[in-house]
């Protein structure tokens, strides 16, 4: 029968043993960084050669004994979760391990740094086709290691690391927390985070996805036919190993950005059990479960989007948190959140000639945390129109007046510390559905893009308050771009996009004891691209 | 590891030479930093990563590394260059006391100084 | 989804061989991970482990102090089940038989691998057996 | 053998009470400990892992904690269907062992 993990990666509609993947991972080489590993074990045997890079610290203790099948155990086990024969993901990749960690699991920074450079070096040496990295491997925070991650990921290579084992917030650990890099955690069976003896997977916003990491069958080093059980962060990072070797291998242009997006694209949505994150951390941490796509054509002409949290801004008065995209992706809205609702709203800036999205603590927050919409969008031409707080008792708007250009996105941000206080409300005019309002004491900002086919439309939802949560979607066909809250309520804490879902938050008046006047209402963009439809209708 | 860690009979103690001039001032205004993991345990003290500003030749990098030595020496203390970074970040690993930090933070072309610290398998 | 299904008779006579079988569906008997269990539940006793089966490579077994010497617990690859037998028995060994399963995997972190056993986590429905003439 | 002493042997309580059920080991297990729920004729189902993961399933009024040899489970709002026996399993060596049991019973 088929190991669960590998069902579960299935994409869904088809059975594991009757889906034909696109391709086995033929034309990728993926580099694993790791222990000494098996290579005649027969699950990888001709599939992984071992280099002859090795830069590990000694093991630590006298009695340690450096029994080969101890020393290849990790290394083995992740070799054939990628690529293994029968238990692998990727059966068709093709393999290259660095030795980094020692006979215990051990290593050092700067032996993965050496280790990243050497792979560099062989890159530059003898160029490839596509190349995943795998670090299977995390230690605290590395400013260092984050670097030069970062200087690979710019080279085209895609790296997959680990989240962690440590039940703690993903970001304090590295490589997971370096952005370019694609950090899993680790689900089970049932769907639920991973618990790893007394600790389990590491959460919050630097995982991107997680993907099956508990009582994952696959080579033991034990003997050339063995198997056993492994668990961990590392295993999951395995899988998205050899899912991103597949989807390289069938479209081996994709950047890191197009790879990235799609993994999360055709993730399962909403099937994690949130209630085993940490409160604060559920908001933050992606509830997606990498899965294979069911066919690598068709997913061109989706206009791609994804969320990026900021780190939280503290909670000084002029704190604010900054949530930047991808190199070649666009920021398409800005918005904010704050879990006191005290916040002076958001704005899109530039910061070295890109948008960034910054929002704005007040007195007496908690801090804010600032959410980017980042979307893949060719040849897109985008700018920020800002209208400054109005004079008249009608509220500021703001509109896209160039030729061309659609609404992606509205934030506002402003200078008085609460303005649900400043009467009145402000609400939209109706056949007006291209532009950004908010209230008087407010600067608007109108994200408004340029690309070719590129249409957009508005979709509300309103509920009379006090309402702790209210969603608007975007339907079927169409990508959510822009999130945001209509003015007219006291008690929002910020909107924030999941999924294709625009969410926005109100402080729970039961505590607050007040009662909100009008209504909470979520305020969504979706667009979608005709261009990207055709050109992929051209390729098939 | 290139050098295991008992070397110490290949350490050079550095004569003083023109590599050994008063280091450079490091630009105006930027004011190069040191990092060391939060987690205490997972610390390896005596190991640097001397991480230098992004254009950095790989001749600059080693004539850095020589200069470290150099000024190291003139203190009294071993050093010993365990590797010349370049091809993705330039710099060195170097393995010296922590008393040298505050003059390694003074090298011409010094970003930030990052003590080693272990990863683990997970 | 696993299942266990137990099968047996339900009277055993004194001194003879109390012989259960547990059929596994949803599951490999010669799972890497798992190990097959008998626990067995009696008023005097209350609930006791008895032993299990594994297989890594090989097979291997466990059983308890109170009942090895006596006991043997076997597996049927072709059937994809496992066998409880139990010697001698007398009327202490009347008692409720569930067959069980529990899984164990290694696991990484900054102190090495470990192996972490996850417990008794599925249960057979359970066969009365009373030891009487 | 490791011995796992479970009290009280049974309780009394009402609906919406919380109730508390501790296991103590004769040497440490770290959280090498699960705890399961009987109800008559039928098998122990499991509602903790771990000593304080919940298992798939099981509502969250259900939680355990504890490491080493002190543990408990705990009912935060007891709900007519939790009326049953409790019973603690220590799965740290290989020869494992069950707590006697705690009967929980309308007051």
């Known amino acids: 029968s088929i190991p669960w993990n590998l069902e579960r990666i299935t994409p869904p509609r088809y059975r594991a043993d009757e889906y034909q993947p696109p391709d086995g991972g033929s034309l990728v080489e993926v580099y694993l960084l790791d222990t000494s590993i098996q290579s005649d074990h027969r699950e990888i045997e001709g599939r992984v050669m071992v280099t002859d890079f090795e830069n590990v610290p000694e093991e630590d203790g006298t009695r340690f004994h450096r029994q080969a099948s101890k020393c290849d155990s990790h290394g083995t086990h992740l070799a054939g979760v990628v690529s293994g024969r029968d238990a692998g993901v990727a059966k068709g990749a093709s393999m290259r391990s660095l030795r980094v960690l020692n006979c215990q699991g051990k290593g050092t920074v700067s032996g993965t740094l050496i280790g990243l450079e050497f792979i560099r070096k062989s890159q530059l040496v003898q160029p490839v086709g596509p190349l995943v990295v795998l670090l299977p491997l995390a230690g605290g925070y590395s400013r260092v290691l984050n670097a030069a991650c970062q200087r690979l990921a710019r080279a085209g290579v895609v790296l997959v690391t680990a989240a962690g084992n440590f039940r703690d917030d993903a970001c304090l650990y590295s490589p997971a927390s370096a952005p370019e890099v694609i950090t899993v955690g680790a689900t089970n069976a049932q769907d639920q985070p991973v618990t790893l003896g007394t600790l389990g997977t590491n959460f919050g916003r630097c995982v991107d996805l997680f993907a099956p990491g508990e009582d994952i069958i696959g080579a033991s080093s034990y003997c050339s036919t063995c198997f056993v059980s492994q668990s961990g962060t590392s295993q999951a990072a395995a899988h998205v190993a050899g899912i991103a070797a597949m989807m390289l291998s069938a479209e081996p242009e994709l950047t890191l950005a197009e790879l990235r997006q799609r993994l999360i694209h055709f993730s399962a949505k909403d099937v994690i059990n949130e209630a085993w994150f940490p409160e604060d951390q559920r908001v933050l941490t992606p509830n997606l479960v990498a899965a294979l796509p069911p066919s690598t054509h068709g997913a061109g002409w989706q206009l791609f989007c994804r969320t990026v949290w900021s780190a939280h801004s503290g909670p000084t008065r002029m704190a604010t948190a900054v949530a930047r995209c991808a190199p070649d992706e666009e920021l398409l809205s800005c918005s904010s959140f704050s879990r006191s609702g005290k916040r002076r709203g958001e704005r899109m800036e530039a910061q070295g000639g890109k948008l960034v999205c910054r929002a704005h603590n007040a007195f007496g927050g908690e801090g804010v945390y600032a959410i980017a919409r980042c979307c893949l969008l060719p040849q897109a031409n985008c700018s920020v129109h800002t209208a400054p707080p109005a004079e008249a008792s009608m509220g500021t708007r703001v509109h896209c007046h160039q030729q061309g250009h659609v609404l992606t996105g509205c934030s506002s941000h402003w200078e008085v510390e609460d303005l649900g206080t400043h009467k009145p409300p402000v609400l939209r005019p109706r056949g007006q559905p291209n532009q950004c309002v908010g209230h008087r004491e407010a600067s608007i900002h109108a994200s408004c893009c340029h690309a070719p086919g590129l249409e957009c439309k508005v979709k509300e939802h309103g509920i009379p308050a006090p309402q702790e949560q209210v969603t608007v979607a975007c339907e079927e066909g169409w990508t959510l771009t822009g999130c945001s809250a209509l003015p007219g309520t006291s008690h929002v804490l910020g909107a924030y996009a999941v999924d294709n879902t625009c969410v926005v938050r109100s402080r729970d008046v039961s505590t607050t004891g007040s009662t909100s006047e009008g209504a909470v209402t979520a305020v969504a963009i979706c667009c979608r691209s005709r261009h990207l439809a055709q050109a992929s209708q051209e390729l098939q | 590891q290139e050098d295991e860690d008992g070397d110490y009979e290949e350490l050079v103690l550095a004569l003083r030479s023109e590599e050994d001039g008063l280091a450079e001032a490091p630009e105006h205004g930027t004011t190069a930093t040191f990092h060391r993991c939060a987690k205490d345990p997972w610390r390896l003290p005596g190991t640097y990563v001397v991480v230098l500003k992004e254009e950095t030749h790989l001749s600059q990098s080693e004539r850095t590394a020589r200069r470290l030595q150099a000024q190291a020496a003139r203190r009294g203390y071993l050093t010993k260059i365990l590797h010349v970074f370049h091809g993705l970040l330039p710099g060195f690993l170097v393995k010296m006391s922590g008393d040298l930090l505050e003059l390694a933070l003074k090298l011409p072309h010094v970003d930030y100084i990052e003590e080693d610290s272990s990863v683990f398998a997970q | 989804q696993l299942n266990l299904q137990q099968s047996g008779p339900g009277l055993v006579n004194p001194s003879q061989t109390l012989s259960l079988t547990c059929a596994i569906s949803?599951?490999?008997?010669?799972?890497?991970?798992?190990?097959w269990n008998w626990i067995r539940q009696s008023p005097s006793r209350g609930l006791e482990w008895l032993g299990r089966?594994?297989?890594?490579?090989?097979?291997?077994?466990d059983y308890a102090v109170s009942v090895k010497g006596r006991i043997t617990i076997n597996p049927d690859t072709s059937k994809n089940q496992f066998f409880l037998q139990l010697n001698s028995v007398t009327p202490e060994d009347t008692a409720v038989y569930y067959c069980?399963?529990?899984?164990?995997?290694?696991?990484?972190?900054?102190?090495?691998?470990?192996?972490?056993?996850?417990?008794?986590?599925?249960w057979g429905q359970g066969t009365t057996v009373t030891v009487s003439s | 053998d490791i011995q796992m002493t479970q009290s009280p042997s049974s309780l009394s309580a009402s609906v919406g009470d919380r109730v508390t059920i501790t296991c103590r080991a004769s040497?440490?297990?770290?959280?090498?400990l699960g705890w399961y729920q009987q109800k008559p004729g039928k098998a122990p189902k499991r509602l903790i892992y771990?000593?304080?993961s919940l298992q798939s399933g099981v509502p969250s009024r259900f939680s355990g904690s504890g490491s080493g040899t002190e543990f408990t489970l705990t009912i935060s709002s007891l709900q007519p269907e939790d009326f049953a026996t409790y019973y603690c399993?220590?799965?740290?060596?290989?020869?494992?062992?069950f707590g006697q049991g705690t009967k929980v019973e309308i007051k």
């Open positions: 089966i594994y297989s890594r490579s090989k097979w291997y077994h």
């Open positions: 069980a399963r529990d899984w164990e995997t290694i696991i990484w972190g900054d102190d090495g691998p470990n192996y972490y056993n996850y417990g008794l986590d599925v």
């Open positions: 399993l220590q799965h740290n060596n290989y020869l494992w062992t």
């Open positions: 040497q440490g297990i770290r959280n090498d």
């Open positions: 771990g000593a304080s």
């Open positions: 949803g599951g490999s008997v010669s799972s890497n991970s798992a190990a």
